[in-house]
């Protein structure tokens, strides 16, 4: 399955989004840093099938689209940029959705590394708990969207290498 | 609010098969994984597998990859759990739960359809 | 596989007494993936204390939850007779998921 180019050019939207998003300095929000334990192995994709490397990326967007969408999210962020964002998570969701299909159908049912999908849960499970015990804080919401900017970072590296094993 | 919908009871043959239902409403049904669970009477908890309503990718127990398939509709927003070749062991309720994460992992339930294999 | 050890299987407790329930882990499971549920007969289970320690919305205070590593424990401070119900530990540390065997809570 080749991803579209339209997807790099909607990752690249949502980061421009996530950047956009910021309401206040991080540097206000230093004592609110933690680290969330990002689960890089999984997307230094050497040892992936290419099956397996989409269902990571899928998970990482699903995840990120549901943290968003929760009602926690709606107040803390603008809901203009917010619904900008689904819309740009959703089409990378269906173009990703479309390529797994694809792989499934492909002679049955890759093997797929459930460990790492249950690494991209855990990352996010860390997320959701921090922001529940700063009770959904302005800086706990900052810190988080610095977060899922440098995942979505990450992300774009194994996409980059997946259009590259096409 | 989130619902999930299972039919109350099936009663089946011996070596038969029985498809159990589980329709999602109050949601996006393709942004979370739908598990399911076993419950012999009077006994725990089984997780048997989850599957992705996204994409259909399916994650299963090993002691379960043989006797049940998960599928999904999208179009009726439902997700499906065959069991095959029953035999009395398999009578149970059998549960849909909606993942999720924090306060939101197995926060919704079935509830739960009773299947009973006899002859 | 993780196996979840609960003791007791069944206890009954009275009126304001205060009740301990301990789910032993096989292996070490991280605190974060350690849950509790409540089951009353004929009903679906229901969340009642994630990752740990934290108590699911609507559950009363007189619950809390702690443990590490292989150890954890469901208490509640003061028995009601509408805390009489199964409570199931679960994980989802690693694949599979797993429950444990459930303790019966009874009113005396």
């Known amino acids: 399955c080749d991803l579209p180019q339209t997807h790099s050019l909607g990752h690249r939207r949502t980061m421009m989004l996530l950047a956009q998003m910021r309401r206040i300095s991080l540097f206000s929000c230093l004592k609110d840093r933690h680290d969330f334990r990002f689960p890089q192995e999984e997307f230094d994709g050497n040892q992936f099938q290419k099956a397996e490397a989409i269902s990571v990326l899928h998970e990482v967007i699903q995840q990120t689209f549901n943290l968003f969408s929760t009602k926690d999210s709606s107040v803390a962020w603008d809901e203009r940029l917010l619904d900008k964002l689904y819309t740009e998570l959703y089409q990378q969701l269906n173009d990703l959705e479309a390529c797994v299909m694809q792989e499934v159908w492909v002679g049955g049912t890759p093997l797929m590394n459930e460990d790492s999908i249950l690494a991209v849960r855990k990352y996010f499970q860390r997320i959701t708990l921090y922001l529940t015990e700063k009770k959904y804080s302005p800086c706990a919401w900052e810190v988080v969207r610095a977060e899922i900017m440098r995942s979505f970072s990450s992300s774009r590296n194994l996409q980059e290498r997946l259009r590259r094993k096409e | 609010q989130v619902q999930l919908q299972q039919p109350g009871a099936e009663l089946v043959k011996p070596g038969a098969s029985v498809k159990l239902s589980c329709k999602a409403s109050?949601?996006?049904?393709?942004?979370?994984?739908m598990h399911w669970v076993k419950q012999r009477p009077g006994q725990g908890l089984e997780w048997i597998g989850e599957i992705n309503p996204s994409h259909g990718r399916t994650i299963y127990n090993e002691n379960f990859k043989s006797k049940a398939t998960l599928t999904v509709d999208k179009s009726s927003i439902t997700a499906f759990m065959q069991l095959s070749s029953l035999t009395s062991e398999d009578s149970a309720v059998y549960f849909c739960?909606?993942?999720?994460?924090?306060?939101?992992?197995?926060?919704?339930w079935g509830q739960g359809t009773l299947v009973t294999v006899s002859a | 596989q993780i196996v979840l050890t609960q003791s007791p299987a069944i206890m009954s407790a009275s009126p304001g007494e205060k009740v301990t329930l301990t789910c032993s882990a096989g292996s070490s499971v991280d605190s974060s993936y350690l849950y509790w549920y409540q089951q009353k007969p004929g009903s679906s289970p229901k969340l009642w204390i994630y990752s740990t320690s934290n108590l699911a919305s609507g559950v009363p205070a007189r619950f809390s939850g702690s443990g590490s590593g292989t150890s954890y424990s469901l208490t509640i401070s003061s028995m009601e007779a509408e805390d009489a119900a199964s409570y199931f530990c679960?994980?989802?540390?690693?694949?599979?998921?797993?429950f444990g065997s459930g303790t019966k809570l009874e009113i005396k």
């Open positions: 739960a909606r993942g999720g994460l924090g306060p939101a992992w197995f926060a919704y």
């Open positions: 679960h994980q989802w540390s690693s694949y599979p998921f797993t």
């Open positions: 109050g949601y996006t049904f393709t942004n979370y994984w």
